[in-house]
């Protein structure tokens, strides 16, 4: 799915007016992008409790298990993002897969992901049938990680 | 940083011809987006060996430590991506932070990230000064996670 851009316009780049309305399917086809989390959502029921499974996807087998929570915005590219929610405060024991080990903390790994928002172009509200894609950094939790607690100097 | 898009064009969307050359700073300002991995690169020297540190960034304190490797393409948005490279085959013991525990595997968490490539528009090579943004899914390893080995049924 491609988006045509014209080089050399004042605002990188500015495009032509048009009489017709873009069909909503077009924008959504372009924006819907990846609508799946790193691990298949169909399996995430495994990871809804504080235990490390011996099968299923990675987020449920981790000793810092997590679930995925959907974040949907139809005016954003990608439209669907997933946030990892840690299911345990501490890491689960490798031996038992269920008891927590206070020596390890289960913590989210955050990342500022590049996203694009569909916006009216600055100073053009209502005048042209054009829109802007505004680049933003959006904070998402990617996964939960088992770490040794930080020792303060 | 915004990108102006015209609604309603046949190819979502098609833009106007222009005589002037786009300055490289403009495209790169728009594409460079997040040029940092989830954890500061300045600290990644902590995580270059198979041990779990008691300080430093999350990737070095994890019992499945990893380092970040740069993936750069000036024709992609975002221009810089970071891949996690696991530094240990097994998880590091929470007690010692150095000895590996064969009960746990340190494995990469993969994700198909939405990216955009700057391309000549289809069938227009050399004829117009316009380009297309092509949406693609690009596989990156986000982090390394300590998991219980999969038990086959």
């Amino acid at each position: 799915v491609s988006l045509r851009i014209q080089e050399g316009c004042s605002h990188l780049p500015s495009c032509c007016p048009s009489k017709e309305q873009e069909p909503p399917e077009e924008w959504l086809k372009w924006s819907s992008a990846s609508v799946s989390p790193p691990e298949p959502l169909s399996h995430t029921h495994h990871a809804e409790s504080c235990r490390a499974s011996k099968d299923g996807p990675l987020n449920s087998r981790a000793i810092s298990p997590w679930s995925y929570e959907l974040d949907r915005d139809l005016n954003r590219v990608p439209q669907d993002l997933y946030h990892a929610r840690c299911l345990c405060p501490h890491c689960v024991s490798l031996q038992t897969g269920s008891h927590m080990d206070p020596l390890g903390n289960s913590v989210p790994l955050y990342h500022n992901q590049t996203v694009f928002y569909r916006r009216p172009c600055h100073g053009e509200e209502g005048t042209h049938r054009r829109y802007c894609l505004e680049r933003r950094l959006y904070r998402v939790s990617l996964a939960c990680v088992c770490v040794r607690p930080r020792v303060m100097a | 940083v915004s990108l102006r898009i015209q609604e309603g064009c046949s190819h979502l969307p098609s833009c106007c011809p222009s005589k002037e050359q786009e300055p490289p700073e403009e495209w790169l300002k728009w594409s460079s987006a997040s040029v940092s991995p989830p954890e500061p690169l300045s600290h990644t020297h902590h995580a270059e060996s198979c041990r779990a540190s008691k300080d430093g960034p999350l990737n070095s304190r994890a019992i499945s430590p990893w380092s970040y490797e740069l993936d750069r393409d000036l024709n992609r948005v975002p221009q810089d991506l970071y891949h996690a490279r696991c530094l240990c085959p097994h998880c590091v013991s929470l007690q010692t932070g150095s000895h590996m525990d064969p009960l746990g595997n340190s494995v990469p968490l993969y994700h198909n990230q939405t990216v955009f490539y700057r391309r000549p528009c289809h069938g227009e090579e050399g004829t117009h000064r316009r380009y297309c943004l092509e949406r693609r899914l690009y596989r990156v390893s986000l982090a390394c996670v300590c998991v219980r080995p999969r038990v086959m049924a």
Partner: antibody
Framework: QVTLKESGPTLVKPTQTLTLTCTFS??????????LGWIRQPPGKALEWLAH???????HYKPALKSRLTITKDTSKNQVVLTMTNVDPVDTATYYC?????????????????WGQGTLVTVSS | DIQLTQSPSFLSASVGDRVTITCSAS?????MYWYQQKPGKAPKPLIY???NLASGVPSRFSGSGSGTEYTLTISSMQPEDFATYYC???????????FGQGTKLEIK
């Protein structure tokens, strides 16, 4: 116009450190998208990429030589320096510096569009 | 690392001949670049991004290909075309530039 010129020793002893300088004009290495690389060519053999430095000081090295190479830039002097430690006779080659950073309407090219004339370095005791 | 294999390594041709040099990548790549090198000289860019001619390059040179197979074609050999030709690619992860082993084009 764009010019690049390599300079450095013509003869180096094994185990020593080789330092090569590329002095360029006609462009600025602080321009977004601009990069400069080092390529070598042993006598009668193929081209081999060694290292690259971008406008924003990000550096890349050939994985097999990474531990021996260091690339740095001095934007104010229009110079890029490559150092190679622990040289061996197999490092005998013509060393070229070359520019990358041409932006077309369709994007950046990863070709080296301007090259220096090269400098022959012999490693021998 | 992606490997590039050029074939043939040596090629004898006559003035007026149509010549094709191929470059095979060990895995799929987006674009290929081509250079011409004459003895004692630095390489000179011929083809950008698979099929775009570099400035000043005669139209008898052309490039094509996709995926793992790329070709450089000289439609009618001229005396000044006898040289060594190299293909090159850029790989974004890890960021590396790779050259083929070269094709030496000689007068038959």
């Amino acid at each position: 116009q764009v010019t690049l010129k390599e300079s450095g020793p013509t003869l180096v002893k094994p185990t020593q450190t080789l330092t090569l300088t590329c002095t360029f004009s006609g462009f600025s290495l602080s321009t977004s998208g601009m990069g400069l690389g080092w390529i070598r060519q042993p006598p009668g053999k193929a081209l081999e990429w060694l290292a690259h430095i971008w406008w924003d000081d990000v550096k890349h090295y050939k994985p097999a030589l990474k531990s021996r190479l260091t690339i740095t830039k001095d934007t104010s002097k229009n110079q890029v320096v490559l150092t190679m430690t622990n040289v061996d006779p197999v490092d005998t080659a013509t060393y070229y510096c070359a520019r990358m950073g041409q932006l077309h309407y369709y994007g950046y090219d990863y070709a080296m569009d301007y090259w220096g004339q090269g400098t022959l370095v012999t490693v021998s005791s | 690392d992606i490997q590039l294999t050029q074939s043939p390594s040596f090629l004898s041709a006559s003035v007026g001949d149509r010549v094709t040099i191929t470059c095979s990548a060990s895995s799929s790549v987006s674009y290929m670049y081509w250079y011409q090198q004459k003895p004692g000289k630095a390489p000179k860019p011929l083809i950008y991004r698979t099929s775009n001619l570099a400035s000043g390059v005669p139209s008898r040179f052309s490039g094509s290909g996709s995926g793992t197979e790329y070709t450089l074609t000289i439609s009618s050999m001229q005396p000044e075309d006898f040289a060594t030709y190299y293909c090159q690619l850029y790989h974004s992860y890890p960021p590396t530039w790779t050259f083929g082993q070269g094709t030496k084009l000689e007068i038959k």
